[in-house]
Interface confidence: medium
Amino acid sequence: KRFHDVLGNERPSAYMREHNQLNGWSSDENDWNEKLYPVWKRGDMRWKNSWKGGRVQAVLTSDSPALVGSNITFAVNLIFPRCQKEDANGNIVYEKNCRNEAGLSADPYVYNWTAWSEDSDGENGTGQSHHNVFPDGKPFPHHPGWRRWNFIYVFHTLGQYFQKLGRCSVRVSVNTANVTLGPQLMEVTVYRRHGRAYVPIAQVKDVYVVTDQIPVFVTMFQKNDRNSSDETFLKDLPIMFDVLIHDPSHFLNYSTINYKWSFGDNTGLFVSTNHTVNHTYVLNGTFSLNLTVKAAAPGPCPPPPPPPRPSKPTPSLATTLKSYDSNTPGPAGDNPLELSRIPDENCQINRYGHFQATITIVEGILEVNIIQMTDVLMPVPWPESSLIDFVVTCQGSIPTEVCTIISDPTCEITQNTVCSPVDVDEMCLLTVRRTFNGSGTYCVNLTLGDDTSLALTSTLISVPDRDPASPLRMANS
């Protein structure tokens, strides 16, 4: 059998084996050692007994999408049946005081590989036995502590494979410079040691994406906006746009990144090198927000122009740094360009990312202020509580709801929350009456809300003892 017979041939992209070599990977046309690494089809009954106490689940994740040329990292984590874990020596042990369906285990080990390897090898002391090899026959690398690594991971993508000895968690990084744009499939098969052979315990696959677009995400925040995820914002208040570029391998670390904004409100283009920008819409309506991100990234060199007929001696080729635009897929696309092969040449290519959103601008409550507080004197004094009127003004749209949150002086421990509908005239002047239990200092958060906005003001107040002569004080506004 060959690797591609064992590892599956599912192909999300039409091109495959004619692929550029991934660095350190091997062709899946190579032979697979089925004696050491048995191959079981899906549904084979042997899977049921491949692991003591249940099935092992492999979870494969990646930091996809990857900008072409950057590194993409894949991580595989093994999840063992309940009450099982890997110890410091790489053995699989039962967790102390953990009860599974079989109850508490008397034997601390699920798999004691240390004991196996000590009495199984007969190896001439080098560790180079015929069974310490990968499925293609390559010997295991003898890093310090390699004997504690009891899982063999075989990664397979793009008609190539990569073998790795590891513990219950491994990571593999792949450079995407030679990978065709679009979705690709990564498949991983995991084996465990079993005496002098190996047993398959899990198979997993995941899609990853290679793109020539800079992956761009934009978060939008506006003070007083009630729901930040509905793309509805308020007129006359700045919106903060924050651009996050997904670049986990730091491919663009040394690139100058330019952000070109069009807010769709006839304010023109705004170009910045800062990933955050504030913009205030002064009209209601629906606007098309467009962002283009541009970065000069390391990339393939364009083909050189045809050389002129030399009339003079040609100067020697120095190391060059070139830059050119790419709006269409370049060498990583489906029709690879012939690349120039100038030694040590260091070219750059302008990569772009785009973000577009339709945002709705509406009236909202822009500001709220407490302009006066009055202690309400009651005919019969209540020994334990005070009634206080807050006179509140607001700007913007008319609120439909008022909430007061009364808490301790640090504003952290809430003591009382009261919300009530309000009917306010266009002057937006209202009185909110609240009860305070006993004297002391209180933090008061007062919010006015409508369907789209929520405006807040806070104040610290000192409520005196029930001595009518004691004035009410606003401690801090």
Epitope: A14, L181, G182, P183, V209, Q213, P329, H354, Q356, T358
Partner: antibody
Framework: QVQLQESGPGLVKPSQTLSLTCTVS??????????WSWIRHHPGKGLEWIGY???????YSNPSLKSRVTISVDTSKNQFSLTLSSVTAADTAVYYC???????????WGQGTLVTVSS | EIVMTQSPATLSVSPGERATLSCRAS??????LVWYQQKPGQAPRLLIY???TRATGIPARFSGSGSGTEFTLTISSLQSEDFAVYYC??????????FGQGTKVEIK
């Protein structure tokens, strides 16, 4: 809100080529985590996935139709297109364009266009 | 390719009653399964993904369950707007993405 709209002739003669275009609005076709698919629904039968295209031009078609299917993309117009050659009466169906999310499922669909193959 | 089989082909239910639709895969698709609803003259609408997660805006009366080869879509109390055709689709092994042939939920 993303919207997709199919357009093209509703009647095609046998052995000719069916051509449809899907126009995407409310979102860019040049997005790295979406793929753009054609799916058809034969009268009285289930849905059949025809093929997809990625903004870069990478395509993949259902092996059952592969030799007859061509899918192309025009990012400047935010459109992608399907051509199906050598059609027969068995290709009579409602044709949908759809946005595929992360190579998993189809989260937005066009309204569909009925294509009848008849002489 | 993975073949998806839905049963029954037609389900007659009275409004307010519970409807249970079944979808079977010819081999395991883990939980990589979605359900769509399609009304006459309309495009399919995404209901459930990941076998059990409701899509945005889908009412709580729709629930999905199952893993491997057997899946169920349950509508706890049928409303008049729920009478439609329901399709399942796997996205575990692709391409191609494959769909069931549909279950029509009609008024009893």
């Amino acid at each position: 809100q993303v919207q997709l709209q199919e357009s093209g002739p509703g009647l095609v003669k046998p052995s000719q080529t069916l051509s449809l275009t899907c126009t995407v609005s409310g979102g860019s076709i040049s997005s790295f985590n979406y793929y753009w698919s054609w799916i058809r629904h034969h009268p009285g039968k289930g849905l059949e996935w025809i093929g997809y295209i990625y903004y870069s031009g990478s395509t993949y078609s259902n092996p059952s139709l592969k030799s007859r299917v061509t899918i192309s993309v025009d990012t400047s117009k935010n459109q992608f297109s399907l051509t199906l050659s050598s059609v027969t009466a068995a290709d009579t169906a409602v044709y949908y364009c759809a946005r595929g999310y992360n190579w998993n499922y189809f989260d937005y669909w066009g309204q569909g266009t009925l294509v009848t193959v008849s002489s | 390719e993975i073949v998806m089989t839905q049963s029954p082909a037609t389900l007659s239910v009275s409004p307010g009653e519970r409807a249970t639709l079944s979808c079977r895969a010819s081999q395991s698709v883990d939980n990589n399964l979605v359900w769509y609803q399609q009304k006459p003259g309309q495009a399919p609408r995404l209901l459930i993904y990941g076998a059990s997660t409701r899509a945005t805006g889908i009412p709580a009366r729709f629930s999905g369950s199952g893993s491997g080869t057997e899946f169920t879509l349950t509508i706890s109390s049928l409303q008049s707007e729920d009478f439609a055709v329901y399709y399942c689709q796997q996205y575990n092994n692709w391409p191609p993405w494959t769909f069931g042939q549909g279950t029509k939920v009609e008024i009893k």
